[in-house]
Amino acid sequence: KIDACKRGDVTVKPSHVILLGSTVNITCSLKPRQGCFHYSRRNKLILYKFDRRINFHHGHSLNSQVTGLPLGTTLFVCKLACINSDEIQICGAEIFVGVAPEQPQNLSCIQKGEQGTVACTWERGRDTHLYTEYTLQLSGPKNLTWQKQCKDIYCDYLDFGINLTPESPESNFTAKVTAVNSLGSSSSLPSTFTFLDIVRPLPPWDIRIKFQKASVSRCTLYWRDEGLVLLNRLRYRPSNSRLWNMVNVTKAKGRHDLLDLKPFTEYEFQISSKLHLYKGSWSDWSESLRAQTPEEEPTGMLDVWYMKRHIDYSRQQISLFWKNLSVSEARGKILHYQVTLQELTGGKAMTQNITGHTSWTTVIPRTGNWAVAVSAANSKGSSLPTRINIMNLCEAGLLAPRQVSANSEGMDNILVTWQPPRKDPSAVQEYVVEWRELHPGGDTQVPLNWLRSRPYNVSALISENIKSYICYEIRVYALSGDQGGCSSILGNSKHKAPLSGPHINAITEEKGSILISWNSIPVQEQMGCLLHYRIYWKERDSNSQPQLCEIPYRVSQNSHPINSLQPRVTYVLWMTALTAAGESSHGNEREFCLQGKAN
């Protein structure tokens, strides 16, 4: 009933709780002398379903047959309407539509840990939409029984609050769950189990790792477990990996040696436990232990390259470059690099430790045979040294690779191709492709990049440190014993017309011709490799087309003569630059009048 129902009653037949699809009869009847004044025909009883009118009747009672009610609760309210007055609430009723409980499925029980309590879960099946009570029953040896009830609306878990002990691990226990509501009842199939079947050990705790003599090859994992644990499984992985290594161990008694860990690597370790070989379930995984393995001396050898630069008749500058070892080769934090420079005939040697850099520059005499050795050191030792004999890398013209080309290959890649040298191609032991940003003036501080290619390759894709709209000087070296030959080319991964033209800084007269000098276009405005400069000139105040002279681009060139100007005529001159994508805008304009004699 919704309220006190002083004025009348609402009755529901056959029941307030009905099976989905059933019909109900709702009757609203006024109590004596509770209708409208005057006479009963004025009474108008109105039936509401929630807040909407669905039926009416004139008189002392209203009878309504209702079908098709949805699952859940529907509220019906009866009101009385009299002429010239507001409706008066008479009474109401809630009707609960649902279904009988389905048979609970997949009943399973576990006890978490040897000291834990037995708890069971099951699948309720479809929602009954009605108040449904679940009773869980457990029976054991010696006619012992335990019972627990659950009155939750969505009940699918109950904890008995009792602890099974290992005194008789093979004793049978049987659990059963029964669901009851107003429309029926249903019981699960019984689930029978022993102590060993349902006790799920607590996850191992207090996990530690020890490295004997700070060595990765002598590593032991320690942990603590509940007393009855027989089996463990260990899983571990480098912290940056998604794949686990898995190990199963029996009777480990809280320790296990690991033999395949990599040095100087952070690992994550987890352990799980089980009481019996084929009964029961594994514990949850333990909390993770994270630990870094000790360093080992580096393996592998550094990839070393060098550049020679002539200083004067007696001295040359050597710049050495090397690449970092990979993490798996470094096997620790590289503390320094050891560079040894040795004159091979006189035996003089100089050793230097270098930290924080992967390059080294020194000046040596141009005479003598020089060699360098470079190794990387961590706290445990050094890598094997990489030895290189310093030679003139481009001296052997017959070893120079032929038909070198450089083409853009997608975003920020350049494909370099070449043909083997004329000299017996089988003499080539390896190719080295070297590239660096092109800087007029040949700035030696510009980073050098290189890659090595097998002797049977005739192409290499370079992508490391390649930027769009930058021109690179690319060299291909063919190395054979203590000889080398090289060829070079300019290349870019992406280009467009330069953003500005060269700036003419001077025009000088020399024997009837002029010499134009200009400043290079700033690198960031070149927008790729320059192919040509153009010098334009025309008579001042003339509307005629300008004449032009096109000069192939050379890195160091910044002046050019022109000898086709007429004396005592004032000319306007300007310059542009071209890449493969097009021509720049004009540089500055300069006026000039040649003073020489007329022919």
Epitope: N55, H58, L62, S64, Q65, T67, G68
Partner: nanobody
């Protein structure tokens, strides 16, 4: 889904008769009281008549009392309106709808409405 389809409208001379029908589907017709409402050209909605779910109680607007008769056949899921002695002021579109009350303002819900049938009374 809910469907109410009115029929039986048309052009009739003053004093003539028409019988409107409304075929219901998509809901449990016998659960609900039903109504006829009308809308004359350029006017608002006007409640005409109502009948309860089992047909034992009816109500009429004063303007049509004694002239119109509402009835229903739950077996056929059909609502009827018998209109006699028709007058030009009865010209309107007639709608069949789930009963919401006996005043024009009760009909704010449009979820149980038909598309209407036109009745025109003119000499």
């Amino acid at each position: 889904q809910v469907q109410l389809v009115e029929s039986g409208g048309g052009l009739v001379q003053p004093g003539g008769s028409l019988r409107l029908s409304c075929a219901a589907s998509g809901f449990t017709f016998s659960n609900y009281a039903m109504s006829w409402v009308r809308q004359a050209p350029g006017k608002g909605l006007e409640w005409v008549s109502a009948i309860n779910s089992d047909g034992t109680s009816t109500s009429y607007a004063d303007s049509v009392k004694g002239q119109f008769t509402i009835s229903r056949d739950n077996a056929k899921n059909t609502l009827y309106l018998q209109m006699n002695s028709l007058k030009p002021e009865d010209t309107a579109v007639y709608y069949c709808t789930k009963w919401e009350g006996d005043t024009d303002s009760d009909y704010k819900f449009k979820d149980y409405w038909g598309q209407g049938t036109q009745v025109t009374v003119e000499p």
